[in-house]
């Protein structure tokens, strides 16, 4: 049994880091493998993660962490029984993938303005809470070419757009994702999408 693709890990900079790797053949990850992880610090504790299957030869492990600070560094040991398959380290602050925003809502009752709001996925006491910016994706269910991205570079989790910038009388969907420049994070996963019917009053034209 060998590791084909070494573990790569990302942290949500809150309580979970996710590590993925591939074995050289079909593997029952949860029964055959264990990923041990330990904070490199005085009197730290070794923890064991039981991986799950992620495709035939792929494994994924969710490492629980009580808290994350920028100096944290973890040792990682991948074991198959008594055999050490791989040894590495992981610094969560250097591999951050934020949590996905939630509760995306489209408010259509504001005079020909669409107000999209969502929730910041972090509690106020988390460092990332005040450092997230967002991308909102809006697309038409009828027209695949009608696909747009709005970058929200301010901290407020909301976006206002004129309803008239979208076509009237058709359904749209929206989703949102987040990233934090301070830690040069990757983008989060997209939030679940929300759907609405876009309709607005055409301006009265005088002839």
């Amino acid at each position: 049994m060998k590791v084909l693709q070494e573990p790569t890990c990302v942290s949500d900079y809150m309580s979970i880091s996710t590590c993925e790797w591939k074995m050289n053949g079909p593997t029952n990850c949860s029964t055959e493998l264990r990923l041990l992880y330990q904070l490199v610090f005085l009197l730290s504790e070794a923890h064991t993660c039981i991986p799950e299957n992620n495709g035939g030869a792929g494994c994924v492990c969710h490492l629980l962490m009580d808290d994350v600070v920028s100096a944290d560094n973890y040792t990682l040991d991948l074991w198959a029984g008594q055999q050490l398959l791989w040894k590495g380290s992981f610094k969560p602050s250097e591999h951050v993938k934020p949590r996905a925003p939630g509760n995306l809502t489209v408010h259509t009752n504001v005079s020909d303005t669409l107000l999209l709001t969502w929730s910041n996925p972090y509690p106020p006491d988390n460092y990332l809470y005040n450092h997230l910016t967002y991308a909102v994706n809006i697309w038409s269910e009828n027209d695949p070419a009608d696909f747009r991205i709005y970058n929200v570079t301010y901290l407020e989790p909301s976006l206002r757009i004129a309803a008239s910038t979208l076509k009237s009388g058709i359904s749209y969907r929206a989703r949102v994702r987040a990233w934090a420049q301070c830690y040069n994070t990757t983008w989060s996963e997209w939030s679940p999408s929300t759907k609405w019917h876009n309709s607005y009053r055409e301006p009265f034209e005088q002839h």
């Epitope: 904070l39 610090f41 005085l42 009197l43 730290s44 504790e45 009580d66 808290d67 920028s70 100096a71």
Partner: antibody, heavy 119, light 107 residues
Framework: QVQLQESGAELVKPGASVKMSCKAS????????MHWVKQTPGQGLEWIGG????????SYNQKFKGKATLTADKSSNTAYMQLSSLTSEDSAVYYC????????????WGQGTLVTVSA | DIQMTQTTSSLSASLGDRVTISCRAS??????LNWYQQKPDGTVKLLIY???RLHSGVPSRFSGSGSGTDYSLTISNLEQEDVATYFC?????????FGGGTKLEIK
């Protein structure tokens, strides 16, 4: 809410030993470290050392090696510190303080145990 | 050992004031700087850990900042219950060491 309950005040004679206790109201004692801190008017706060109750690992301030011995009883969520060969310099308030395992900040503190060394 | 210096041993301020308490380390401590509050009855509580992280249950009027060797604790809107002695502590290098404390009183 985590609470640490320390044993009561001690009046001991020079040359004797004293053993104080600290009981933690936590679910999994092994996920924490128990540290001990000395406070005197002259020296202020001094870190004595810490213990991982799960595996028994200890770390001591060199100044207190040979003076303090840290132990724990996992079954009762209780940590102990024994001080030996006591002198008047050991008269102080001693605090137990809990950290999450491998952390450098004392998240919860006991109320303190006053030790008075006097003939 | 790393020396932690709190140059102000005591200070007096009025209710509602913004108060800043400083702490200097004798060498770089890489943000491993924590702040504690000791009430007159001896009760000790963690306020801020790792320079600027607010411990759970601590009012948001407390904040911390700094880097390298210089750190500070700020109380933005002083209340009567903040009367206490405040200690800094470094957790970067063994042995972990504390500052001498700053006693805060109300004018």
């Amino acid at each position: 809410q985590v609470q640490l309950q320390e044993s009561g005040a001690e009046l001991v004679k020079p040359g004797a030993s004293v053993k104080m206790s600290c009981k933690a109201s936590v679910n999994t004692f092994t996920g924490y470290n128990m540290h001990w801190v000395k406070q005197t008017p002259g020296q202020g706060l001094e870190w004595i050392g810490g213990l991982h109750p799960g595996n028994g690992d200890t770390s001591y301030n060199q100044k207190f090696k040979g003076k303090a011995t840290l132990t724990a009883d996992k079954s009762s969520n209780t940590a102990y510190m024994q001080l030996s060969s006591l002198t008047s310099e050991d008269s102080a308030v001693y605090y137990c303080a809990l950290t999450t395992a491998g952390r450098a900040w004392f998240a919860y503190w006991g109320q303190g145990t006053l030790v008075t060394v006097s003939a | 050992d790393i020396q932690m210096t709190q140059t102000t041993s005591s200070l007096s301020a009025s209710l509602g004031d913004r108060v800043t308490i400083s702490c200097r380390a004798s060498q770089d401590i890489s943000n491993y700087l924590n702040w504690y509050q000791q009430k007159p009855d001896g009760t000790v509580k963690l306020l801020i850990y790792y320079t600027s992280r607010l411990h759970s249950g601590v009012p948001s009027r407390f904040s911390g900042s700094g880097s390298g060797t210089d750190y500070s604790l700020t109380i933005s809107n002083l209340e009567q219950e903040d009367v206490a002695t405040y200690f800094c502590q470094q957790g970067n290098t063994l042995p972990w060491t504390f500052g001498g404390g700053t006693k805060l009183e109300i004018k």
